[in-house]
Amino acid sequence: KAMHVAQPAVVLASSRGIASFVCEYASPGKATEVRVTVLRQADSQVTEVCAATYMMGNELTFLDDSICTGTSSGNQVNLTIQGLRAMDTGLYICKVELMYPPPYYLGIGNGTQIYVIDPEPCPDSD
């Protein structure tokens, strides 16, 4: 079943390569287990950036080597992606799945365009 997911259209990452945004889903029921996946679309290719499954009321747990961290509050997931470089500029799509209890719901946002600017190199000093 389909579910609405909202996320900002455009975000500029910080000069340290960190971008945070909220992914909000309109939960039709009382889900206890939710899976959040961040997909990156660039030049027509879609790749998975990170994913986490969490129990409502608990923290999101990404893999140890993940570039993502996140917190949840109700139907909102606050996602942070770090270690971004200019080459990582692209459309980051939030996919939310309500895993349990049934029925299963799937929602995919329109994506957040994350622009990443590599810091200017410092001029050499004498």
Partner: antibody, heavy 117, light 108 residues
């Protein structure tokens, strides 16, 4: 409909500052960015920089760094561009534009800033 | 900085003719981040094409964009009287975002 309405024309003396406003309507202001572009009389378009309204992060053109500041007031859905230490070659029409995933649309109607002693 | 060079500087054509405008980048540009704008005297620019080839809302299908890498083209299949204007390309691929110097399409 989505609209950006800018403040009126200004005449400034060299060395002074100017602050141009851009009021947005018809969309969720915090979801997009606002870019500023200027056009000197009879010349082409020059990108000045932009602000990510969602988090307030900014990216300025190198040549204006230190003289330009872009801010927003989310309570009134208004973006501002302040340019300091004005020179005669800053005389231009200043445009704001909504930044989407890979476009500027729409644009404000433009604000003429004249720098003259 | 990515420099965009537009050619020709001026294009003199008659209504009904085909216009081909070129935009060449000094470095490779992701086609996702190349746009075209139209500007008429005394007016703000208007988005025509984004992502190198996608028409903006309300833009007639006589306008089309193509290209990749360093070479991009805006084509107007049959010029209408209202199409005589200045056209700019712009890249968002790398900061600073830059515009071409513009191509003026004038009535012959």
């Amino acid at each position: 409909q989505v609209q950006l309405v800018q403040s009126g024309a200004e005449v400034k003396k060299p060395g002074a500052s100017v602050k141009v406003s851009c009021k947005a309507s018809g969309y969720t202001f915090t979801s997009y960015g606002i870019s500023w572009v200027r056009q000197a009389p009879g010349q082409g378009l020059e990108w000045m920089g932009w602000i990510s309204v969602y988090n307030g992060n900014t990216n300025y053109a190198q040549k204006l760094q230190g003289r330009v500041t872009m801010t927003t007031d989310t309570s009134t859905s208004t973006a501002y561009m302040e340019l300091r230490s004005l020179r005669s070659d800053d005389t231009a029409v200043y445009y704001c534009a909504r930044v989407g995933a890979n476009w500027f649309d729409p644009w404000g109607q433009g604000s003429l800033v004249t720098v003259s002693s | 900085e990515i420099v965009l060079t537009q050619s020709p500087g001026t294009l003199s054509l008659s209504p009904g003719e085909r216009a081909t405008l070129s935009c060449r980048a000094s470095q490779s540009v992701s086609s996702s981040y190349l746009a075209w704008y139209q500007q008429k005297p005394g007016q703000a620019p208007r988005l025509l094409i984004y992502g190198a080839s996608s028409r903006a809302t309300g833009i007639p299908d006589r306008f089309s964009g193509s290209g990749s890498g360093t070479d991009f083209t805006l084509t107007i299949s049959r010029l209408e009287p209202e199409d005589f204007a200045v056209y700019y390309c712009q890249q968002y691929s790398r900061s600073p975002w830059t515009f071409g110097q513009g191509t003026k399409v004038e009535i012959k």
